[in-house]
Interface confidence: medium
Amino acid sequence: LTDEEKRLMVELHNLYRAQVSPTASDMLHMRWDEELAAFAKAYARQCVWGHNKERGRRGENLFAITDEGMDVPLAMEEWHHEREHYNLSAATCSPGQMCGHYTQVVWAKTERIGCGSHFCEKLQGVEETNIELLVCNYEPPGNVKGKRPYQEGTPCSQCPSGYHCKNSLCEPIGSPEDAQDLPYLVTEAPSFRATEASDSRKMGTPSSLATGIPAFLVTEVSGSLATKALPAVETQAPTSLATKDPPSMATEAPPCVTTEVPSILAAHSLPSLDEEPVTFPKSTHVPIPKSADKVTDKTKVPSRSPENSLDPKMSLTGARELLPHAQEEAEAEAELPPSSEVLASVFPAQDKPGELQATLDHTGHTSSKSLPNFPNTSATANATGGRALALQSSLPGAEGPDKPSVVSGLNSGPGHVWGPLLGLLLLPPLVLAGIF
């Protein structure tokens, strides 16, 4: 990633965290971690569309995009749009929706993020070729089983000892930014020199997000696909494709707190390779039937197969989902979901990468690009043996005709009964800041 992309990733996380609604009393400011970045980069080089089973106590989000190169705002957008489906007070996600990416982004106690990307001519587990894979790792872990992402309350009212409030986030006292003097900008003309401190908001190295995930995790395989013009697309279960509407502009986007927050696109959760029940297949694909079961726009668009349906620019996202408590890692128990839920059981880490233990026998509905709002309907997949996959569609909110449609994947697991929409700040579609 370029310096700009790193900063953009970090600052978008911090902006999203600062803007949570209800407000957070204990939200930590996040900063970039080069060790995590190196770890993420090393895994990205493996070109596997699945989570890193060696990641230990690190959270992980995945994103991939075809052809045009990395698009950090789009990645963030896809990870974050799930806020629409998450209810903080109930700690629930709307049935059939994903919320894990969002909860990682706003997990209050995560402080560090590191991301790396790699261009993969072939991404294992995805039919598309020439894909840029983004891996982000987080520490400390987020999505802890039975825990809410953050405590609701007056911003910074529950900052830990040794932290102070900055832009509604708890920032460590004595952090690199604080160690510096106030910013000064001295303008000089040939015969003029003066110094004056500018606004007190200090600026320094990127802060960062980190949502870590211990070795035992409840994660779902799910798929998500969006194309610029086609609402129904065939894809594999673990893949998530979303057309990147504007060409990649991550390097043209602001390198800091990008307030032109991305518009909302589909996100997708990947299977945890740490668990036996939801192992990512090395070669096994679970295709979505060519005909989707519901088109959420009045204008029906025929489904297409990958060969002719995918726009040159697509993206995929993946996230690790709910964690058991750190103390419970070694004995995380499988929990049966409510009837309306689709989730995977938790088992000790025993990887059987060749097995896909959840079968997909129902596909999500599709949505066309012209829909103005997120559809409330979704279709979940029935799974065998208590393990499940799910597919559903979500659509960018009021994005206009130039935005892609989306079929997104479910991300859910025990510890959270995913439920209704959370009234979070609805961010408008992305107009990349400073695009020229």
């Epitope: 600052e11 930014e177 200090k202 190295t205 707190v257 800041a433 695009i435």
Partner: antibody, heavy 112, light 104 residues
Framework: GGGLVQPGGSMKLSCVAS????????MNWVRQSPEQGLEWIAE??????????HYAESVKGRFTISRDDSKNSVYLQMNNLRPEDTGIYYC??????????WGQGTTLTVSS | VMTQSPAILSVYPGEKVTMTCRAS?????MHWCQQKPGSSPKSWIY???NLASGVPARFSGSGSGTSYSLTISRVEAEDAATYYC?????????FGSGTKLEIK
């Protein structure tokens, strides 16, 4: 301080920054005049992209923005100055799509 | 084009004041800066509703699309300044003409 320049003349402004990691930030020049109010002039981005630059239409071809990260400095070379270029010139850094910090400004007067 | 109104706002301390900024085209976010006489502008509110560091909680921002506002719940003497809205949803970065807040 400030400078008086005749129309058609040139001047180079400098801005020295401290207190933040200069190389991480996009540096801008904004000018202010009673007639035009606040007006964005130019921006230079980061080394990682070979320092791309952008200009307001009103100064394209006449002004050049540059930076020296080793000196925490950004510059504005202004050529073929016009009376309407008169104003207070601020350097400003941005880490997003708004300006986080502004310099104290220097006044440029273009008059014969 | 960014149009701010009113151009001048004269209020007593303790009053609630609201100034507006209208964009000719829809923008995703609005930012506000404060400028006091003889000083350079300061970032004041970013991303429509987020207060910059050090900005008193009596300030708030809201809006969407083409209409945005900055509100001060109880004006204090130190709030006397000119407030500019600014956007970069479209090229180039543009500023409003400013609302001058006077305290009686």
């Amino acid at each position: 301080g400030g400078g008086l320049v005749q129309p058609g003349g040139s001047m180079k402004l400098s801005c020295v920054a401290s207190g933040f990691t200069f190389s991480y930030y996009w540096m801008n020049w904004v000018r202010q005049s009673p007639e035009q109010g606040l007006e964005w002039i130019a921006e230079i981005r980061l080394q990682s992209n070979d320092y791309p630059t952008h200009y307001a239409e009103s100064v394209k071809g006449r002004f050049t923005i540059s930076r020296d990260d080793s000196k925490n400095s950004v510059y504005l070379q202004m050529n073929n100055l016009r009376p309407e270029d008169t104003g207070i010139y601020y350097c400003a850094c941005r880490y997003a799509d708004y300006f986080d910090h502004w310099g104290q400004g220097t006044t440029l007067t273009v008059s014969s | 084009v960014m149009t701010q109104s009113p151009a001048i706002l004269s209020v007593y301390p303790g009053e609630k004041v609201t100034m507006t900024c209208r964009a000719s085209l829809s923008v995703s976010y609005m930012h506000w800066c404060q400028q006091k006489p003889g000083s350079s502008p300061k970032s004041w509110i970013y991303a429509t509703s987020n207060l910059a560091s050090g900005v008193p909680a009596r300030f708030s921002g809201s809006g969407s699309g083409t209409s945005y506002s900055l509100t001060i719940s109880r004006v204090e003497a130190e709030d006397a300044a000119t407030y500019y809205c600014q956007q970069w949803s479209s090229n180039p970065f543009t500023f409003g003409s400013g609302t001058k807040l006077e305290i009686k």
